[in-house]
């Protein structure tokens, strides 16, 4: 057979050949960082001629062109500078909001050498919608400007940019947009391993956390997750072995998959791993139906036995058949376990597709994904049971659109990636599941099912009491620390008499713990402003209790997520590099933020935290309280910016004994403490011995009810000072 000509140099770059100059060989160009090859590749045809994939005109000279990042097409409620058609590598774009709008995301973004912007999409939001303004990523055009429940927004990319993420998103009942943020990217762009590893890792860790909401430490094995329930994960690894993958690259695919297997088994969750290689046809090397799929050594051994030559007779890329073999495996397992059994329905499934190109035979891979979604009953409500990661390697013939179509779409997560080469892939798998970075206690997990007990719904909730009567409430923020209010401890300091009652699955009365030490904010002094006519002042009303023993994590005892920590960052599924400010913008993102506290009887009550201008009018009412503040001239002397304010309209008000308890909100089915109950103008339990009876304030009451809660975002220095070695704090 004729060989292809060798005059294929690229000025300023280099090239590699998959099979020399022979027909079927793929020539791949590469350029220094900040440049991209045009064309990216050529294929040696049986005629002895080079063909450029997708090219319409005859062979052009290969050149390295400068990478550029896409420009904003529109930016709502603000301005950006400089205004260019596209931006060079290293170039910045800055965003500012109009009055009345708050900037969420990155105020300044830089164009990176891979043609991608750093940071997060900048959005100017006034918090008016049911869902936050979803923004418009750079290079995108959005239609739809209403953000109420059920409203939809649609995105498309300008000019020749490719959309990854969701082209349509719907505002859901929980105030979160469906799908994942759309990003417009240059067709030649790719992802850096240092971005992919945490993105993949965050998503995977979230899935592992969902597979295993209750974990326990095995000291000898360091920080590892151990399944305590019936949760099970099926992991399907699909390795492209088509003609365009060189033997060396296939070896790296195998090594990367081995790393993944090794890492996933180190989590000690119940996992079964399937291994499938594919070209024109799939070859199942390990099925989840095989008991050996639960044995790490067997799985790795089957990977090692994967042979590049297994597919030499069929060299196309049949991604449909590979995914369909996963579907058939699922179908068989469903029949084996029984369609309606918990054993089948509670399995979570993760598919990792490693490919170097677009499918070029068989059916549409998307249809195979549809079949998989159908058999697993995946819909918006059961989205957690399936994750498909589509990873393209070698930015030559990888089809962004196809990868994006196959990858799962989940809010705050990415499932489709393109890496420059197999070395980058290896790096990703090495770093994506760094067990040491995962804490033993997954925070903010409450049981939301209708038949759960109050304590299972809010397992962080604790009662703090002296020998006699109950006084205060608090929240577990780790397995040994409780966050509460300082004013609970103003009557005497002998904590040896105090007890902390923590939830316990074995007893409806909970379990009592002694206090090893109480750290009370030195700034707290209820009489600090007496001489100004302020009879009681609750600034710095915050305290930490270290329990004498560690609490055993269970369905009834589990810490709540504290914002501004890595633990909360993982639960929020935010990217690495997020800051405390980012958490505040995400959690307190509206003028009126729905939140909760726990009542004396253990039930969860609703309040609305007022922010911005609504905070001012909420706090203003204090000036009408003449008994406690007889000659108050400035409300801010009493209600400093340390406080969150609630108690308007239909809000419940906390009772006296509920002080110190968490003020928390729910995001992505996880719970985050943003405040703690401190003081208020009305006690709904006054004069009632019954824990279940609360009296609403009469409408005519002057002043009307108002409640103030210590804002944890304003107490960061103090929290960091005392919890620095307990929790992993993010930069401010």
């Amino acid at each position: 057979a004729p060989s292809c000509p060798q005059n294929v140099n690229i000025s300023g770059g280099t090239f590699t050949l998959s099979h020399g100059w022979a027909p079927g060989s793929l020539l791949t160009y590469s350029c220094p960082q900040g440049l991209y090859p045009s064309p990216a590749s050529r294929l040696c045809k049986s005629s002895g001629q080079w063909q450029t994939p997708g090219a319409t005109r005859s062979l052009s000279k290969a050149v390295c062109k400068p990478v550029r990042c896409p420009a904003p097409v529109s930016f709502e409620n603000g301005i950006y500078t400089p205004r260019l058609g596209s931006y060079p590598v290293g170039g910045n774009v800055s965003f500012e909001c109009e009055d009345g709008f708050i900037l969420r995301g990155s105020p300044v973004r830089q164009c990176r050498p891979n043609g991608m912007w750093d940071g997060e999409t900048a959005v100017c939001d006034n918090g008016a919608g049911h869902c936050p303004n979803p923004g418009i990523s750079l290079g995108a055009v959005r239609t739809g400007f209403r953000f109420g429940h059920g409203d939809k927004v649609r995105y498309r990319c300008s000019s020749n940019l490719v959309l990854t993420g969701s082209s349509e998103r719907e505002c859901q009942g929980n105030g979160v947009w469906s799908g994942t943020e759309p990003i417009c990217r240059q067709p030649y762009s790719y992802d850096f391993p240092e971005d992919v590893a945490p993105a993949l890792g965050t998503s995977f860790s979230h899935m592992l956390g969902a597979t295993n909401p209750t974990q326990k430490t095995k000291e000898s094995l360091g920080r590892k997750i151990q399944i305590q329930r019936s949760g099970h994960l099926n992991l399907y690894l699909l390795l492209d072995c088509s003609q365009s993958v060189s033997e060396n690259d296939f070896l790296i695919f195998k090594e990367s998959a081995s790393l993944m297997v090794d890492r996933i088994f180190s989590f000690e969750i119940n996992v079964s791993v399937a291994i499938i290689t594919f070209a024109s046809e799939p070859k199942v090397l390990m099925s989840v139906l095989n008991d050996n799929s639960r044995d790490m050594t067997e799985v790795i051994s089957s990977l090692e036995n994967a042979n590049y030559k297994d597919h030499e007779n069929g060299t196309g890329t049949n991604t449909y058949a590979a995914l369909n073999s996963v579907y058939l495996m699922m179908n068989n397992q469903m029949r084996l376990l029984g369609m309606e059994t918990m054993a089948w329905q509670e399995i979570r499934h993760a598919i990792i597709l490693l490919t170097d190109g677009k499918s070029n035979m068989g059916g549409s891979p998307k249809t195979a994904v549809d079949h998989i979604r159908e058999i697993l009953n995946i819909n918006q409500k059961r989205n957690d049971y399936l994750d498909i990661y589509a990873i393209g390697v070698g930015k030559l013939d990888v089809d962004w659109r196809e990868l994006n179509e196959l990858g799962s779409k989940k809010d705050g997560e990415r499932h489709a990636f393109i890496l420059q080469d197999t070395k980058a892939l290896h790096q990703v798998f090495e770093h994506m599941l760094d067990v040491s970075k995962l804490t033993d206690t997954i925070c903010g997990v409450g049981n939301m099912s209708a038949n759960a007990s109050d304590q299972e719904r809010t397992p962080w909730h604790v009662t703090i009491k002296p020998k006699s009567q109950e006084t205060c409430r608090g929240a577990l923020i780790s397995d040994q620390w409780v966050l509460t209010a300082a004013h609970c401890f103003r009557d005497g300091n002998d904590h040896s008499l105090w007890r902390v009652n923590v939830g316990d699955p074995k007893s409806q009365w909970g379990k009592e713990f002694l206090i090893e030490k109480a750290v009370i904010s030195p700034g707290f002094d209820v009489f600090a402003k007496k001489n100004q006519g302020i009879l009681e002042f609750y600034g710095d009303d915050i305290a930490l209790l270290k329990l004498a023993q560690k609490v055993k994590m269970s369905t009834h005892a589990r810490p709540i997520c504290l914002p501004c920590t890595m633990e909360a960052n993982l639960a929020l599924r935010r990217p690495q590099g997020s800051t405390c400010r980012d958490h505040e913008n995400e959690l307190l993102n509206k003028q009126s933020v729905p939140a909760h506290f726990v009542a004396l009887n253990g039930s969860k009550l609703n309040i609305n935290l007022k922010m911005g201008v609504e905070w001012t009018s909420c706090a203003e009412v204090v000036s009408q309280e003449k008994t406690m503040f007889p000659n108050l001239t400035d409300v801010r002397e009493v209600v400093t910016d340390q406080f969150l304010c609630s108690g308007t309209q239909e809000d419940e008000s906390p009772c006296k004994g509920e002080s110190g308890g968490a003020v928390f909100l729910e995001r992505r089915f996880r719970f985050f403490q943003v405040g703690l109950v401190s003081w208020g103008l009305y006690n709904p339990c006054l004069g009632s011995a019954d824990k279940n009876s609360r009296k609403r304030a009469p409408r005519s009451k002057v002043p009307p009810p108002r409640d103030f809660h210590i804002n944890l975002f304003r107490m960061q220095p103090w929290l960091r000072q005392h919890l620095g070695d307990v929790l992993n704090f993010l930069p401010l």
Partner: antibody, heavy 125, light 106 residues
Amino acid sequence: QVQLQQSGPGLVKPSQPLSLTCAISGDSVSSNSATWSWIRQSPSRGLEWLGRTYYRSKWYHDYAVFVKSRMTINPDTSKNQFSLQLNSVTPEDTAVYYCARGGMPASDIPHFDNWGQGILVTVSS
Amino acid sequence: SYELTQPPSLSVSPGQTASITCSGHKLGDKYACWYQQKPGQSPVLVIYQDNKRPSGIPERFSGSNSGNTATLTISGTQALDEADYYCQAWDSITYVFGTGTKVTVL
């Protein structure tokens, strides 16, 4: 507006095949977003889904377990219709047979938004 | 196999609210829809994706779905609402219909 018009015999002898056709107007049988199903209804067993066909770069067919071995659904793109063939019928197969347009459960559309007028098929000698 | 159970019949006075339930294991994890069928006619979709109404369906029809139960509510029931109502969901490899509820407007 989508309309489905059914045709076929109202009486079939036991052990014979039952053949029905559903003509589509206002949509295409090879649409990339629709699925085309056959459903039947009898007083004893209520509504039962029998099977579906749909096109996504190639044709796919799915059948209910209880009729899988004797049922075929065929699309006909030239006439923009699809047909049902149920072999070896018994009196148990006596029912009103409907064709219907649905979406993909995978796309959160597991319902039928258009139905044919229905044909009562009696299996009797 | 998966089953959806409905009460066989329900009587309601004009102007009153009729609530029809549909029970199935973890039905709340699936999307439920509802069909209305009048004698001699084909079923008509009245609710899809738990609580959405197709165009042309009156606002008095509403739906909800959580836990093991989906509910179709007809508020201010009218004489022309007298019909059989069926719930339906998808389960892994098949479409499943409810047993049907006959609603009589007194």
